[in-house]
């Protein structure tokens, strides 16, 4: 017996814009889309979308970035370089909710912590983040 | 605690794995103050590309 | 496809306690949260409990602390339910839902549990 | 706790029909609610989550909105396939609760 899977991919989070594969319905409360099941699929970075209202997003592709004669890290072919990051909250409790985009408390975290990555890395060359999930410590 | 584990994305040759540990290791005092977050056993790695939601959470449990 | 399969169908005696299983397939992740909810016979649905797979983290229903013990396998992507001291109003199907980037996402068939001497 | 009023218990329709079937919350829970299909056989089955966004292989014409703390869930054009029984579930808050379900049967 299966459920019935979503099929929306990752938000790449940034300033306000974001880059995904699928759209997926976001409701009117919520300053991120809510997909599903963001954790199950491949994320890509298809399209560049500018969110105007929950309910609509315009798109165009992703113009071609920059890109220097080294590399940093396994790239597409559009010139971006990928991290995977892993750090601990201590002074937060971790709860069923956090597995959820469209609770309160799922959101105010991954608020916080978009914005605290767009502080951290304001130098330039920061495209955003993306396959946030959260998990007890 | 919480545990977080994202992906983030930066133009190719404007930063290395090093880099980007550093800048968020130097973050860890403000983010305290400014966003009540107190981070600690922080971890950064490539991703390989191409590469699925799936892939990158394996090393954390 | 991602699948859930539950443990079959179970007669215990009242007092006695029941573990059942739930084990969950397709899917590449190996931590994600697991809810318990039960179905007594011709009611609603009934919210147990939660585990985060290959963790100790656990919520409980009030309602069923100190007779509910929650845990999991994550090498067998499995999640168990231990009911302790049955009584005949347990006797129920009981249903396993994990996540999948939002709760409650996946079904499994249910497990029914019937309490009789 | 946080109660889910689900109206209404039970209702026939025919195939073609609209069918509405509403869930009121007695706290605010702001989109954490889901709509759930229970077949006859027993089976489970998520159609909406986050009160409105449809669940992939789940058919157009079921769809949620809400209305304060009125939630809805609405099939526009009632199938074979869709007699069964509905609930709503919230998730705001610990303990998660069920509304008491509807039975949508054949007129």
């Known amino acids: 017996a299966s459920g019935s899977a979503s099929g929306s991919a990752s938000t790449l989070v940034h300033n306000g814009t974001s880059a995904r594969a699928t759209t997926t319905p976001a409701s009117k409360s919520t300053p991120f889309s809510i997909p599903s099941h963001h954790s199950d699929t491949p994320t890509t970075l298809a399209s560049h979308s500018t969110k105007t209202d929950a309910s609509s997003t315009h798109h165009s592709s992703v113009p071609p970035l920059t890109s220097s004669n080294h590399s940093t890290s396994p790239q597409l072919s559009t010139g971006v370089s990928f991290f995977f990051l892993s750090f601990h909250i201590s002074n937060l409790q971790f709860n069923s909710s956090l597995e959820d985009p469209s609770t309160d408390y799922y959101q105010e975290l991954q608020r916080d912590i978009s914005e605290m990555f767009l502080q951290i890395y304001k130098q330039g060359g920061f495209l955003g983040l993306s396959n946030i999930k959260f998990r007890p410590g | 605690s919480v545990v977080v584990q994202l992906t983030l994305a930066f133009r190719e040759g404007t930063i290395n794995v090093h880099d980007v540990e550093t800048q968020f290791n130097q973050y860890k005092t403000e983010a305290a103050s400014r966003y009540n977050l107190t981070i600690s056993d922080v971890s950064v790695s490539d991703v390989p590309f191409p590469f699925s939601a799936q892939s990158h959470h394996h090393h954390h449990h | 496809e991602v699948q859930l399969v539950q443990s079959g169908a179970e007669v215990v005696k009242p007092g006695a306690s029941v573990k059942m299983s739930c084990k969950t397939s397709g899917y590449t992740f190996t931590s994600y949260g697991i809810n318990w909810v039960r179905q007594r016979p011709g009611q609603g649905l009934e919210w147990i409990g939660y585990?985060?797979?290959?963790?100790?983290?656990?919520e409980y229903n009030e309602k069923f602390k100190g007779r509910v013990t929650l845990t999991s396998d994550t090498s067998a992507s499995t999640a168990y339910m231990e009911l302790s001291s049955l009584r005949s109003e347990d006797t129920a199907v009981y249903y396993c839902?994990?996540?999948?980037?939002?709760?409650?996402?996946?079904w499994g068939q249910g497990t029914l549990v019937t309490v009789s001497s | 706790d946080i109660q889910l009023t689900q109206s209404p218990s039970s209702l026939s329709a025919s195939v073609g029909d609209r069918v509405t079937i509403t869930c009121r919350a007695s706290q605010d829970i702001g989109i954490t609610l889901n709509w759930l299909q229970q077949e006859p056989g027993g089976a489970i089955k998520r159609l909406i989550y986050a009160t409105s966004s449809l669940d992939s292989g789940v058919p157009k014409r079921f769809s949620g909105s809400r209305s304060g703390s009125d939630y809805t869930l609405t099939i526009s054009s009632l199938q074979p396939e869709d007699f069964a029984t509905y609930y709503c579930l919230q998730y705001a808050s610990s303990p998660y609760t069920f509304g008491g379900g509807t039975k949508v049967e054949i007129k």
């Open positions: 585990i985060y797979l290959g963790s100790d983290y656990t």
């Open positions: 839902a994990r996540s999948g980037g939002s709760l409650f996402a996946y």
